[in-house]
């Protein structure tokens, strides 16, 4: 991608670059991408895939460049890399290009999905595991039950998913999960598809959020404080109906009995 | 001034029911979870459990997970940490924090700060 | 859950010295969710640091905080009397939340 003839890693080894204050940001957003050479440098141009030129010059005498994107469009997403040079080299040649720098810039992250593990059928004593899977790796994964409007659990995760165990008593119930990036300026994903968890014989179901009857989105906490999470008593005490996929277990984050739960 | 009070301190008896409190004031209480950390005599930090009071909600560390009952009332500002049967290892200093709660679009978030505020403490002491 | 391991479990030095506090976690911990608190004998824990590196309102930046992954610093770069106290790192990113067992910085 990068024209410019570029030497044997020995000779001139590849720079770091970063984007501050992320690589995923809102439109709008001013976004500095940093090259950092390991040696004082003339000359930084950044490069994006497809570009005969770079993309950007910057000429000063140190280690490090800064490459101003100012209020950053959806358009100026994409893939980058950095490479730097010094006067005493020949012409047209340039450093080993940086690692790539992939930066997004969007309002909302996709959809995550939300499946049940391990499946299909476990006992009243046994925990049950929601899987939240996303598409990118070191994201905050937010779990969250229906009518309430505080997550159930959370976790930062270097994958692109995380797993959330609830304890088999307190399992059923309606469930949805988004993920959103660990630092400012935060960007959040559309809501999963909720996932409904219930006893053997009622049958597990996903449906689309915004076909979810009664569905309350996290947000504004519920009116009716006795509604924040179906009664338990209603659940005949059998098997949970899950949907199956690899087994994958994590430390639980309890959450309180449901109000109209006096005491499983 | 924004700031947290908590409750006096308590000596009980094994068996006996408590129940401490602690008042926010000088900011928005439904905007920050209540935090409630354990320190027993001569030992660290234990997170118990965090309440949001905008629903009332909490969530419970495992290890206190039926053990204790966390509750708010926000039209005054006071959440509360109760026991139903004490016992001597609940001997210890309880603490109650803030910590910001983070929205975007109107969905509450993983917490993005620290707990900033806390209050003096309450202590509790189980003795027979 | 993530644990944190902090040490050393006890800091001897004397005021004027540089403090090095490290605390490391049992698995990774995004740095926006990790904080270091102080207390003192008798008193509620203090805020000193969080999102691993930014300093709370009103604390001197004396103090600071760096690291991510699974390895963290909290550096106190010429401790002054007040600072002999209990340091407490914490994770609030993943429930449940968790804290180390704390460094005693004591008088040499």
């Known amino acids: 991608d990068i024209t410019p003839s570029v030497p044997p890693a020995s000779y001139h080894p590849k720079p770091w670059l970063g984007a501050q204050p992320a690589t995923v940001v809102t439109p709008g957003v001013n976004v500095t991408l940093r090259c950092r050479a390991p040696q004082p440098a003339w000359r930084f141009g950044l490069f994006k895939p497809g570009e005969i030129a770079p993309l950007l010059f910057r000429d000063v005498s140190s280690e490090l460049a800064e490459f101003f994107l100012e209020e950053v469009t959806p358009a100026q997403g994409g893939i980058y890399r950095c490479c730097y040079r010094r006067p005493d080299w020949g012409p047209g040649v340039w450093s080993q290009p940086s690692d790539v720098l992939e930066l997004l810039v969007t309002e909302e992250l996709p959809r995550p999905s939300l499946v049940a593990l391990p499946g299909p059928v476990v006992g009243p004593g046994a925990n049950v595991s929601l899987r939240c899977a996303g598409r990118l790796r070191n994201m905050s994964f937010v779990l969250y039950r229906e009518g309430v409007a505080a997550p159930l659990q959370y976790r930062h995760s270097a994958q692109p998913w995380a797993d959330f165990t609830l304890l088999g008593a307190r399992a059923p119930g309606t469930y949805s999960c988004y993920y959103h990036t660990p630092s400012a300026p935060y960007v959040l994903s559309q809501r999963s598809e909720v996932l409904v968890i219930s006893w053997e014989g009622e049958g597990p179901e996903a449906r689309p959020a915004s076909s979810a009857p009664g569905m309350q989105a996290p947000g504004p906490p519920p009116s009716d404080p006795g509604a924040q999470a179906p009664s338990l008593s209603s659940f005949r005490p059998r098997g949970l109906v899950l949907q199956p996929l690899l087994p994958q277990t994590q430390d639980s984050w309890d959450p309180a009995p449901p109000p109209s739960d006096p005491g499983v | 001034e924004v700031q947290l009070v908590q409750s006096g301190a308590e000596v009980k008896k094994p068996g006996e029911s408590l129940k401490i409190s602690c008042k926010g004031s000088?900011?928005?209480?439904?905007?920050?979870?209540i935090v409630w950390v354990r320190q027993m005599p001569g030992k660290g930090l234990e997170w118990m459990g965090s309440?949001?009071?905008?629903?009332?909600?909490?969530r419970y560390s495992p290890s206190f997970q039926g053990q204790v009952t966390i509750s708010a009332d926000k039209s005054i500002s006071t959440a509360y940490l109760q026991w139903s049967s004490l016992k001597a290892s609940d001997t210890a200093m309880y603490y109650c924090?803030?910590?910001?709660?983070?929205?975007?679009?109107?969905?509450?978030?993983?917490?993005?700060?620290?707990?900033?505020?806390w209050g003096q403490g309450t202590t509790v002491t189980v003795s027979s | 859950e993530i644990v944190l391991t902090q040490s050393p479990g006890t800091l001897s030095l004397s005021p004027g010295e540089r403090a090095t506090l490290s605390c490391r976690a049992s698995q990774s911990v995004s740095s926006s969710y990790l904080a270091w608190y102080q207390q003192k004998p008798g008193q509620a824990p203090r805020l000193l640091i969080y999102?691993?590196?930014s300093r709370a309102t009103g604390i001197p930046d004396r103090f600071s905080g760096s690291g991510s992954g699974t390895d963290f610093t909290l550096t106190i770069s010429r401790l002054e009397p007040e600072d002999f106290a209990v340091y407490y790192c914490?994770?609030?990113?993943?429930?449940?939340?968790?804290f180390g067992g704390g460094t005693k910085v004591e008088i040499k």
């Open positions: 999102g691993a590196s």
């Open positions: 000088g900011y928005s209480f439904t905007s920050y979870w």
């Open positions: 309440i949001y009071p905008g629903d009332s909600d909490a």
């Open positions: 924090a803030r910590q910001k709660i983070t929205m975007v679009r109107g969905v509450i978030i993983t917490p993005l700060d620290g707990m900033d505020v």
């Open positions: 914490q994770q609030y990113g993943s429930s449940p939340l968790t």
